[in-house]
Interface confidence: low
């Protein structure tokens, strides 16, 4: 029902935030957490943070790692705390970026996400718990 809502969104996760985009904050909330590594002018730039809109994270997290950038994504409170993204090494196959570190995860089920075909509505993610 349209107005049956309280329980503050159980599908937003607390994520560790590290890097320029975090400002003075050391955490953020989003629908996915990430840890990334990129090479910028020869320097390794590590970042951690969150994707606040699921579709944004869905696209980025499915991007295969390249020699210049890798992103690992996860869903769960602080799930990116102990994740360090790694660039692929020559001649070695690199696991997909959706390897979700299950021991720290509360994975969203396929049913919760509405399947691959259905774009998830942010509004659906915002329902509070209701008895």
């Amino acid at each position: 029902m349209e107005d049956e809502k309280p329980k503050v969104n159980p599908k937003l996760y607390m994520c560790v935030c590290e890097g320029l985009s975090c400002g003075n904050e050391d955490h953020c909330e989003g629908q996915q957490c990430f840890s990334s590594l990129s090479i910028n002018d020869g320097f390794h730039v590590y970042q951690k943070g969150c994707f606040q809109v699921y579709e944004q994270g869905k696209m980025t997290c499915k991007t295969p790692p390249s020699p210049g950038q890798a992103v690992e994504c996860c869903q769960g409170d602080w799930c990116n705390r102990n994740i360090t993204a790694q660039l692929p090494t020559k001649g070695k196959s690199f696991p997909g970026t959706q390897n979700f570190h299950l021991e720290e995860q509360k994975l969203i089920s396929e049913e919760d996400l509405g399947g691959e075909q259905k774009l998830i509505s942010e509004e659906d993610l915002h329902h509070h718990h209701h008895h």
Epitope: E2, D3, L12, Q52
Partner: antibody
Framework: QVQLQQWGAGLLKPSETLSLTCAVY????????WSWIRQPPGKGLEWLGE???????NNNPSLASRVTISVDTSKSQFSLRLTSVTAADTATYYC?????????WGQGTRVTVSS | IQMTQSPSSLSASVGDRVTITCQAS??????LNWYQQKPGQAPNLLIY???NLLPGVPSRFSGSGSGTDFSFTISSLQPEDIATYYC?????????FGGGTTVAIRR
């Protein structure tokens, strides 16, 4: 990350309408619920109501129909209107961003109702 | 849902263990948060979902409880902990806070 900046009139007469606006910076507007909370001088916190990016609202029944919360996603702003104010509405009003908790807060606006 | 917090104020010495309790008028399914508010500032979320500390929150703060009865503990009170602490539930609307507990340092 998310920053909230709020503004509005600080001095009102009884029966006037309180109007406050909160601007959201560095945050996805669709990722949070946006609430107003007030705190009378020396007292506790009272949740007034909330809105999401689509304009769906939930208000505290204790304020009946006096509260209106609206959103302008194009400006990343949300607003509070409280009609027919009395001295009992004197408080510091905060805008907040929340999911499971009120994680981000505006700086607060002190509103005094006095004749 | 009413949230009853006690005591309303307390005074303790630096290094003391301080405990605040919060009782909900019905089962809130562990949807309980704790906030710290220092004078002249907005409240600050310390603990969400009963016992989860936000990053940067000192480990001397902890939360526990379930169902309707919850507690918040400062294991070793520090001068910078002088503040008012609030519990808040989000199991149903309206979202409500406890009345607050003001913590002072005993001289």
């Amino acid at each position: 990350q998310v920053q909230l900046q709020q503004w509005g009139a600080g001095l009102l007469k009884p029966s006037e309408t309180l109007s406050l606006t909160c601007a959201v910076y560095n945050g996805s507007f669709s990722s949070f619920y946006w609430s107003w909370i007030r705190q009378p001088p020396g007292k506790g916190l009272e949740w007034l109501g909330e809105i999401n990016h689509r304009g769906r609202t939930n208000n505290n029944p204790s304020l009946a129909s006096r509260v209106t919360i609206s959103v302008d996603t194009s400006k990343s702003q949300f607003s509070l209107r409280l009609t027919s104010v009395t001295a009992a509405d004197t408080a510091t009003y905060y805008c907040t961003a929340h999911t499971r908790g009120f994680l981000y807060w505006g700086q607060g606006t002190r509103v005094t109702v006095s004749s | 849902i009413q949230m009853t917090q006690s005591p309303s104020s307390l005074s303790a010495s630096v290094g003391d263990r301080v405990t605040i309790t919060c009782q909900a008028s019905q089962d809130i399914n562990n949807y309980l948060n704790w906030y710290q508010q220092k004078p002249g500032q907005a409240p600050n979320l310390l603990i969400y979902d009963v016992f989860n500390l936000l990053p940067g929150v000192p480990s001397r703060f902890s939360g526990s409880g379930s169902g309707t009865d919850f507690s918040f503990t400062i294991s070793s009170l520090q001068p910078e902990d002088i503040a008012t602490y609030y519990c808040q539930h989000y199991d149903d609307l309206p979202l409500t806070f406890g009345g607050g507990t003001t913590v002072a340092i005993r001289r």
